[in-house]
């Protein structure tokens, strides 16, 4: 008998998964930029805001050249999972002032989840170690005030914007190495 029948191709392969991750990240970056601009229009920020529970920015322009595929994907997934939980929290804890942005925050959360799925699939297909995403470092209690939730929203969107910005650059660089 000849060789056994092969398997039909599944929907994508690791390189297609990486392409898809780049497109999703770019799209999410555009959404985040737009939402951050809406926030600044509706609730002008008095300086920079941060939240202790947010991840620190993983990469700078100078370190892009030394990126390795496993490190980038692991860190990106862990950081995006943290932002996903923060957006979830923001939608639950937001006061009436932020309710006007609920559709946009809901769409952002759904897109974040889609990107996280894609990154995990890519890591599975490459057989890279998948660290369990940590819970946020600081338990996310309700904001102290309406202004507290607005400051938190500024911090979350600002941090997510920076993270996605380096993610696009990092993923594009990694495409050349796969």
């Amino acid at each position: 008998p000849g060789p056994p029948a092969g398997s039909p191709r599944v929907s994508s392969d690791p390189r297609a998964d990486l392409d898809s991750a780049v497109l999703l990240t770019r799209s999410l970056l555009a959404d985040t930029r737009q939402l951050a601009a809406q926030m600044r229009d509706k609730f002008p920020a008095d300086g920079d805001h941060n939240l202790d529970s947010l991840p620190t920015l993983a990469m700078s322009a100078g370190t892009l050249g030394s990126l390795q595929l496993p490190g980038v994907l692991t860190r990106l997934r862990v950081d995006l999972m943290s932002y996903f939980r923060h957006v979830q929290w923001l939608r639950r804890a937001a006061g009436p002032s932020l309710k006007t942005l609920e559709p946009e925050l809901g769409a952002l959360q759904a897109r974040l989840e889609r990107l996280l799925r894609r990154l995990q699939l890519l890591m599975s297909r490459l057989a890279l170690p998948q660290a369990a995403p940590d819970q946020p470092a600081v338990p996310l209690g309700p904001p102290a005030s309406a202004w507290g939730s607005i400051r938190a929203a500024h911090a979350i969107l600002g941090g997510l914007h920076l993270t996605l910005d380096w993610a696009v650059r990092g993923l594009l660089l990694l495409k050349t190495r796969l």
Epitope: G6, S7, R9, V10, D13, P14, R15, P70, M81, L116, R117, Q120, L121, S124, R125, L126, A127, L128, P129, Q130, A131, A132, P133, L178
Partner: antibody, heavy 114, light 111 residues
Framework: EVQLLESGGGLVQPGGSLRLSCAAS????????MHWVRQAPGKGLEWVAV????????YYADSVKGRFTISRDNSKNTLYLQMNSLRAEDTAVYYC???????WGQGTLVTVSS | QSVLTQPPSASGTPGQRVTISCSGS?????????VHWYQQLPGTAPKLLIY???ERPSGVPDRFSGSKSGTSASLAISGLRSEDEADYYC???????????FGGGTKLTVL
Amino acid sequence: EVQLLESGGGLVQPGGSLRLSCAASGFTFSSYGMHWVRQAPGKGLEWVAVISYDGSYKYYADSVKGRFTISRDNSKNTLYLQMNSLRAEDTAVYYCAAGVPDYWGQGTLVTVSS
Amino acid sequence: QSVLTQPPSASGTPGQRVTISCSGSSSNIGSDYDVHWYQQLPGTAPKLLIYSNNERPSGVPDRFSGSKSGTSASLAISGLRSEDEADYYCAAWDSSLYGPVFGGGTKLTVL
């Protein structure tokens, strides 16, 4: 069409060694993590070992740690499993699988018996 | 003892809808790792049926669907057919083992 073709199985005595090979074609082998998964007669699937797309990461099930070694040669599109100190409980059909796993070979039977 | 728990058997009549469950823990399904499902027809190698919780590879009929919630997942087969008689396995990455883990398998019988 994706093909994974295992070879190297057979009858071996307890304490003996075998080397399984898996020849891959129809996809970009060097872009996929590769697994060995086994199935004892009449039993379920048991993951054995995995190697990352570039060979830099290797992980093993506790039941084979220290006895089995997974490796790959991307220039030959081939996956290997070196099995030493074989035991009766290692008797199974050994499948080579790619990705999630997305693709599976037809398997090769390893029988450990005196 | 499998890391993921599935019922050993399930059955249904042609046309019926059948659901197979897969229960895990905080180191696999509960850690937000995706669940994949495999179909193994008698005497053949396993075949990927559902990946990333609910995505179907090309060629898999939309009668098959997957879902996940918390530390559990499930596979649903609607419009059951005689050719669906097979063993079904769930799988997920496990952070404590640094590899994928499988359920014990569910033997589906079409009555």
